[in-house]
């Protein structure tokens, strides 16, 4: 006869490990007992369990409540046991010793490998600002056994660097993603991808990039100066900019206070029916936590009567 077992049994932390040991005997051979022990190098054998043909299952005190026989139906030549709720400390070498009649004793060894799936964590780097050089966007750390793989999935251009720390029964891997911040990266996803044999599928943690910036300010509304004449209604100036975080707007008049009746509505300055007193230099102040910008325009309100008089003069002069 001969013993059938596995060289390596792999199980995920917390799962039950089946330690196989099957005696393939000749006709008429009987198994008297199967003794299981842990036999790590450099340490004495530690008894695990005894499967006895007459007495049944005995579990040694150190493994009380954690070793069982596989559920029925059972073959009397099958000395396999279940190690419940595998923990990292269970990883190691195990031996089954089978006492048979009349063939004698047989033994076989297997290695139990306990996979510890990682629980990854993603830590954003310092605040990203346009104009910075190469900056840490995020770091991702995952610890497991064996060492997990940590990669990045993103459309953003950047560089990665990884380092690994070995512990007694596991390894921690940290990967950093560096980039040169630009406003085009704003809102883009940066995904840490962790792979490990103990995971059914890759674990993904996504971080949305936020890059602080403030665009140059400009004012719209004066494209056609002829529209800015006395009596015109609905005239307005709009301040144009964009930023992250979104900017706030403030309007002032350089050559005095804002005329009465002029309404400030965020980025928009609304005028009542125009009069000559609305002429002046207007300044739009745009600011966010990152920066501030100014843009100024000169409003010159035309008097249509003056204009028509001049035209008449011109005509008569001709």
């Amino acid at each position: 006869g001969e013993l059938e077992t596995s060289d390596v049994v792999t199980v995920v932390l917390g799962q039950d490990a089946k330690l196989p040991c099957f005696y393939r005997g000749d006709s008429g051979e009987q198994v008297g007992q199967v003794a299981w022990a842990r036999v790590d190098a450099g340490e004495g054998a530690q008894e695990l369990a005894l499967l006895h043909s007459k007495y049944g299952l005995h579990v040694s005190p150190a493994y009380e409540g954690r070793v069982e026989q596989p559920p029925p139906p059972r073959n009397p030549l099958d000395g396999s046991v279940l190690l419940r709720n595998a923990v990292q400390a269970d990883e190691g070498e195990y031996e089954c010793r089978v006492s048979t009649f009349p063939a004698g004793s047989f033994q076989a060894r297997l290695r139990l490998r306990v996979l510890v799936p990682p629980l990854p964590s993603l830590n954003p780097g310092p605040a990203l600002e346009e104009g910075q050089g190469l900056t840490l966007a995020a770091s991702c750390t995952a610890e497991g056994s064996p060492a997990p793989s940590v990669t990045w999935d993103t459309e953003v251009k950047g560089t990665t660097s990884s380092r690994s720390f070995k512990h007694s029964r596991s390894a921690a891997v940290t990967s950093e993603f560096h980039l040169v911040p630009s406003r085009s990266m704003n809102g883009q996803p940066l995904t840490c991808v962790v792979s490990h044999p103990g995971l059914l599928q890759d674990q993904r943690i996504t971080h949305i990039l936020h890059v602080s910036f403030l665009a140059e300010a400009s004012v719209r509304g004066l494209e056609d100066q002829n529209l800015w004449h006395i009596g015109r209604e609905g005239a307005m100036l709009k301040c144009l900019s964009e930023g992250q975080p979104p900017p706030s707007y403030n309007w002032t008049r350089l050559d005095g206070p804002l005329p009465s009746g002029v309404r400030v509505d965020g980025d928009t300055l609304g005028f009542p029916p125009l009069t000559t007193e609305h002429s002046g230099i207007y300044v739009c102040h745009v600011s966010n936590e990152f920066s501030s910008r100014d843009s100024q325009v000169t409003v010159d309100v035309l008097d249509p009567q003056e204009d028509s008089g001049k035209q008449v003069d011109l005509v008569s002069a001709s």
Epitope: G32, Q33, A35, E47, L50, H52, K54, Y55, G56, L57, H58, S60, P61, R97, S99, S105
Partner: antibody, heavy 126, light 107 residues
Framework: EVQLVESGGGLVQPGGSLRLSCAAS????????MSWVRQAPGKGLEWVSG????????RYADSVKGRFTISRDNSKNTLYLQMNSLRAEDTAVYYC???????????????????WGQGTLVTVSS | DIQMTQSPSSLSASVGDRVTITCRAS??????LAWYQQKPGKAPKLLIY???SLQSGVPSRFSGSGSGTDFTLTISSLQPEDFATYYC?????????FGQGTKVEIK
């Protein structure tokens, strides 16, 4: 025929010592684990100590731990129990017994006691 | 330690009676249980091992059953030589422990 013969019992004062012997014959002594079991007058059976075949693994009941020592001399087919610091509650008939040999090389369990000696009486009294 | 509780502690029966003695372990012991018979002034004698296996030379009127925590010794037809004290013993853990005994007396 398997025979186990105990000797060494007797009257001893509290705090005293005795050494019990058990001579085995009629079987291969080296192949069997052995135990000592005692029975106080009018009481039940109490396992005292046991030793595996090679003599390397000795176990004791809590009530005698640190005071009694079990040993064996396989060349003389003899089992011993050295009893020190004896107390009145150690008064009993002490039996040596052979353990049934159907569990191989597994120290965590003992086996049934298939042969017993006739017993030797130990009396601890002042 | 595992506690072994026998019942009854004594019983009176007549020759030819069927006698049942029970033994309960304080925790599961698979079939690591033996039964012994002891007569006054004599050493105990192994009757049953592995809960139900009859020791060589023991009459077939003795039988054992059970596993886990509950066990039974049955004498199918009591004979005059069977009047004695009976002990159960677990050997699942060290120390092995005995029941307190059941004395079978003549009615």
């Amino acid at each position: 025929e398997v025979q186990l013969v105990e000797s060494g019992g007797g009257l001893v004062q509290p705090g005293g010592s005795l050494r019990l012997s058990c001579a085995a014959s009629g079987y291969n002594f080296t192949s069997y684990d052995m135990s000592w079991v005692r029975q106080a007058p009018g009481k039940g059976l109490e396992w005292v100590s046991g030793i595996k075949t090679g003599g390397g693994s000795a176990r004791y009941a809590d009530s005698v731990k640190g005071r009694f020592t079990i040993s064996r001399d396989n060349s003389k087919n003899t089992l011993y129990l050295q009893m020190n610091s004896l107390r009145a509650e150690d008064t009993a008939v002490y039996y040596c017994a052979r353990e049934y040999s159907d569990v191989v090389d597994y120290v965590s369990v003992r086996t049934p006691l298939d042969y017993w000696g006739q017993g030797t009486l130990v009396t601890v009294s002042s | 330690d595992i506690q072994m509780t026998q019942s009854p502690s004594s019983l009176s029966a007549s020759v030819g009676d069927r006698v049942t003695i029970t033994c309960r372990a304080s925790q599961g012991i698979s079939s690591y249980l033996a039964w012994y018979q002891q007569k006054p002034g004599k050493a105990p004698k192994l009757l049953i091992y592995a809960a139900s296996s009859l020791q060589s030379g023991v009459p077939s009127r003795f039988s054992g059953s059970g596993s886990g925590t509950d066990f039974t010794l049955t004498i199918s037809s009591l004979q005059p030589e069977d009047f004695a004290t009976y002990y159960c013993q677990q050997h699942y853990t060290t120390p092995p422990t005995f029941g307190q005994g059941t004395k079978v007396e003549i009615k």
